[in-house]
């Protein structure tokens, strides 16, 4: 498990509507409380089961939020990011970055409807299985001749 780790990074626009539990997720990060080393971005820390984000299904824990209603979240204090969310109103448009680990280690997450986010082993295992079946069938066929 020591080899190279590849990541597939995708961006997505997600529109959420506040409900009785708000947007249904919490955030971490900001220039004053970095969540990822050398990155002051805002990240989704937890998603509430049955909340607005969970029901939508696309936002995932660990996603980076790039903008809120078109307002960039780069280089903001945590509280400034919170204020952007507070002023965002009832319907909120999020630009988010999903980061999928595609090799060596646990499978990451991907946005729904992201066809390119398929871990490589999910392709290789069926191909290998088909090859084995074909080889076995060929050997049986040769024995009968």
């Amino acid at each position: 498990m020591n080899g190279r780790v590849d990541y597939l990074v995708t961006e997505e626009e997600i529109n959420l509507t506040r409900g009785p539990s708000g947007l249904g997720f919490n955030i971490v990060g900001g220039t004053d409380q970095q969540y990822v080393s050398n990155d002051s971005g805002i990240y989704v820390s937890r998603i509430k089961e049955n909340g607005a984000a969970a029901l939508d299904g696309r936002l995932q824990e660990g996603d980076k939020i790039l903008s809120v209603n078109g307002q960039d979240l780069k280089n903001l204090l945590h509280q400034d990011a919170v204020d952007l969310f507070r002023n965002a109103g009832y319907a909120v448009s999020l630009r988010v970055q999903h980061r999928l680990q595609v090799q060596n280690g646990p499978i990451g997450h991907r946005g729904e409807g992201d066809p390119s986010g398929i871990p490589i082993f999910m392709v290789l295992v069926p191909v290998f299985a088909l090859t084995m079946v074909a080889a076995w069938a060929f050997m049986r066929y040769r024995q009968q001749l």
């Epitope: 506040r18 708000g22 947007l23 937890r46 204020d83 969310f85 507070r86």
Partner: nanobody, 130 residues
């Protein structure tokens, strides 16, 4: 911990009025949302009304007859029920949701009547119209 306690139920004649109270405690946010649901014998629990700091909703069956209000100083939400009908007979429950939002804001929203939104429920108060 969050607690909800309903009171004010009772027996009333058709056309009469009652005021239900829902006393809430244990909140860490000023923006909590409270809804009223009711459950008649043998029926599903259904949404009656919802109130937040910025919006209010009513089920079609109670519009114009029921009024929801809140007293933030007392952490209490009221449901004033007028022109009561026999079909209003049910156990009335208040409910609230844990707020998960970067800003701490929450609203009822147009799908407030979904039972899945609500995390905390009171024990209920019986209303009988007969």
């Amino acid at each position: 911990d969050v607690q909800l306690v309903e009171s004010g139920g009772g027996l009333v004649q058709p056309g009469g009025s009652l005021r239900l109270s829902c006393a809430a405690s244990g909140f860490t946010s000023d923006y909590y949302v409270i809804s009223w649901f009711r459950q008649a014998p043998g029926k599903e629990r259904e949404g009656v009304s919802c109130i937040s700091s910025s919006d209010t909703y009513y089920a079609d069956s109670v519009k114009g007859r029921f009024t929801i209000s809140r007293d933030n100083a007392k952490n209490t939400v009221y449901l004033q029920m007028n022109s009561l009908k026999p079909e209003d007979t049910a156990v009335y429950y208040c409910a609230t949701a844990a707020i998960w939002d970067p800003s701490g804001l929450a609203v009822c929203g147009s799908s407030w009547y979904r039972r899945g939104w609500w995390d905390y429920w009171g024990q209920g108060t019986q209303v009988t119209v007969s």
